[in-house]
Interface confidence: low
């Protein structure tokens, strides 16, 4: 009978510089000796080496040398004795390219070379980036382990060295940043910064390095209202708007935060379960109403926690007046005027552009005041007739603008005469 | 074969700028940073910095930075050095050189001799 | 920045002979270290990285030795060819610096 020799193993494979690769191997030999049981030795060559003589790569028996260069890194993997020859190669180099061949020998009757099924080892440069493994999402405040390694690396050869660079890490001991492991407790400005871990192997110039940019949870820590795109100052987690009466408002809420915050507009102060008046940051309103006075709050939904802000509407007005108009009466000539602002307003009377301040000391005229609802009422007594034509004029004010109106009053054919001339000057 | 070919001797005035440059070949050009270095008559070697063709990321030097600026083109494996506001002080030979595979082999350019004179 | 001091500037050998160069860094480079040699007209060419390993080709006289400050080249069995000069280049920080060089002459 023939005897069998046979070598199963990939003809070649590719490695890239400084990583490991395992090759898979299995042969067969004929053996066939009950009476004795010399040890199984096996190694492998560098093609075209006189194994009598050559060092090995790798081998099982201990008085074989093996090539200093080769020494640690291509090691036998697995058992012989079940006929496994799988080489293991650790830290290749680019002088480790070339084809390598399989031998067996075991007592006096076993001594083969399996030459028809060399394996070829192909090192090429290193492109392998490095991983960088953690948990996400990343949530801020919260510790994370992050790991770096790099595919296909292998405890072989010189060790490796690691450096962590980006913004998260600024408050980080140097020394825990040369880890291959670091822990990281991300901040809110921390998301979309980017974080590199940057490998080398010791006694090497060139250096490997990978990118991630962060993606950090946070719940909104702040909120800021705009109005015409300038925020408005929040005290207390309350805001304070003075609006003008029958202007249009557009007011948008913001509230940063990863994935982005649910912002809604509230009238008033809410309960947890209130309806809003607006699903999104933005609140219209086509034309402000005093009755609008009072607040509004926008509220800030995030799945790490909610935040919300109460905004004071203040509805101002500039002052509406009637009048003034004037007839004769008993007592002498009757003025009124009606106004209507929001705060309320000043009022005072002139005539002919002298103001009459309270009520006159010679009893010449007087002044009464009085409001109800929005509307304020004055009313000013002439004593006496006109000796000539006469302006009377009377403003209010407040300090968002004033409005004064004027009638003029004409002499009539006698004193009693009632011709008034309304004029807005 | 790896190649690093620069461009040839340059002859400028001061307050002029120059560029050099230097053609990649045998590898592939984005894998590796390409170095720069200057070496002035009968002195020692100073680097200038570096440049990842990959992104175009430079780091330099801070004594040369505002003087060379560094740019590559990836389509014609090509690295650049301009050198600007020349004095007599920049005249020197400028490499190029690169570390090649896991262990950094040194590849160097044959160098540019840049002289500054009026 | 890192400063790599080569103190002697010029060394005398004959063939045959064992020569030491040095190189001082300013602060601790670990074994960060290169070894060039620079013939007259020629680019540097890289002889030894990480203080002692051998580039691939590099005749087995060329040895490099030391850690933290210190370094040595040593060339045992100077040949002619070795005429040349030789810098020592530290890689542990950026910039990378190079010391001033040691021209070496065959007597």
């Known amino acids: 009978e023939k005897p069998v020799y046979e070598l199963q193993v990939q003809k070649s494979v590719t490695v890239q510089e400084g990583l490991c690769v395992l090759v898979p191997c299995s042969f067969s030999y004929p053996w066939r000796s009950w009476y004795s049981s010399p040890p199984l030795y096996v190694y492998w060559f560098r093609d075209g080496e006189i194994p009598y003589y050559a060092e090995v790569v790798a081998t099982n028996n201990p008085d074989r040398r093996v090539k200093p260069e080769t020494q640690g890194r291509f090691r036998l993997l697995g058992d012989v004795q079940k006929k496994n020859c799988s080489l293991s190669i650790g830290d290749a180099r680019m002088e480790d390219t070339g084809s390598y061949f399989f031998r067996v020998e075991r007592g006096r009757d076993v001594k083969y070379s399996y030459q028809q099924n060399k394996l070829n080892l192909e090192v090429t440069a290193l492109i392998e980036k490095p991983d960088i493994h953690f948990l996400e999402p990343l949530e801020s405040g919260r510790p994370t382990r992050l790991s770096c390694s790099l595919p296909g690396s292998c405890e072989a050869g010189p060790p490796l060295t690691f450096s962590w660079t980006g913004n998260a890490l600024s408050p980080l001991d140097p020394e825990t940043t040369r880890s291959s492991e670091l822990t990281l407790t991300p901040r809110p400005e921390d998301h979309g910064t980017n974080l590199t871990c940057q490998m080398k192997r010791q006694g090497a110039q060139v250096t490997t390095e990978r990118t991630v940019q962060l993606n950090v949870s946070y719940a909104p820590q702040t909120i800021t209202i705009f109005r015409n795109g300038i925020a408005l100052e929040i005290l207390q987690n309350t805001s304070y708007l003075p609006v003008l009466e029958g202007q249009a408002l557009r007011l948008l809420c913001d509230a940063p935060s990863n994935p982005p915050a649910h912002l809604s507009w509230f009238q008033g102060s809410p309960a947890l379960n209130a309806t809003p008046i607006s699903n999104t940051g933005i609140l219209e309103l086509r034309r402000v109403r005093s009755a609008e006075e009072g607040g509004f709050t926008c509220r800030a939904q995030h799945p790490l926690g909610f935040l919300q802000i109460f905004l004071n509407l203040s509805v101002y007005s500039l002052p509406q007046l009637l009048g003034p108009s004037c007839s004769w009466e008993a007592e002498g000539l009757h003025c009124r005027c009606s106004f209507r602002a929001r705060p309320a307003p000043s009022l005072c009377w002139r005539l002919e552009e002298k103001p009459l301040e309270g009520n006159s000391s010679q009893g010449s005229f007087k002044v009464n005041s009085s409001s109800a609802g929005p509307w304020a009422n004055s009313s000013l007594i002439l004593h006496g007739g006109l000796s000539s034509d006469l302006k009377v004029s009377c403003k209010a004010w407040n300090i968002y603008g004033s409005q004064s109106g004027s009638v003029l009053l004409l002499q009539g054919r006698s004193n009693l005469g009632t011709g008034v001339v309304p004029a807005a000057l | 074969e790896i190649q690093l070919q620069q461009s040839g001797p340059e002859l400028v005035k001061p307050g002029a700028s120059v560029k050099v440059s230097c053609k990649a070949s045998?590898?592939?050009?984005?894998?590796?940073?390409m170095y720069w270095v200057k070496q002035s008559h009968g002195k020692s070697l100073e680097w200038i910095g570096y440049i990842d063709p990959y992104n175009g990321g430079t780091t330099y030097n801070q004594k040369f930075k505002g003087k060379a600026t560094l740019t590559v083109d990836k389509s014609s494996s090509t690295a650049f050095m301009h050198l600007n506001s020349l004095t007599s002080e920049d005249s020197a030979v400028f490499y190029c050189?690169?570390?090649?595979?896991?262990?950094?082999?040194?590849?160097w350019g044959q160098g540019t001799l840049v002289t500054v004179s009026a | 920045d890192i400063v790599m001091i080569q103190s002697q500037k010029f060394m005398s050998t004959s063939v045959g002979d064992r020569v030491s160069v040095t190189c001082k860094a300013s602060?601790?480079?670990?074994?960060?270290v290169a070894w060039y040699q620079q013939k007259p007209g020629q680019s540097p060419k890289a002889l030894i990285y990480s203080a002692s390993y051998r580039y691939s080709g590099v005749p087995d006289r060329f040895t490099g030795s030391g850690s933290g400050t210190d370094f040595t080249l040593t060339i045992s069995n100077v040949q002619s060819e070795d005429l040349a000069e030789y810098f020592c280049q530290q890689y542990n920080s950026f910039p990378l610096t190079f010391g001033s060089g040691t021209k070496l002459e065959i007597k």
């Open positions: 602060q601790n480079v670990d074994t960060n």
């Open positions: 045998g590898y592939s050009f984005t894998d590796y940073n």
């Open positions: 050189a690169f570390y090649y595979g896991y262990y950094g082999v040194p590849y």
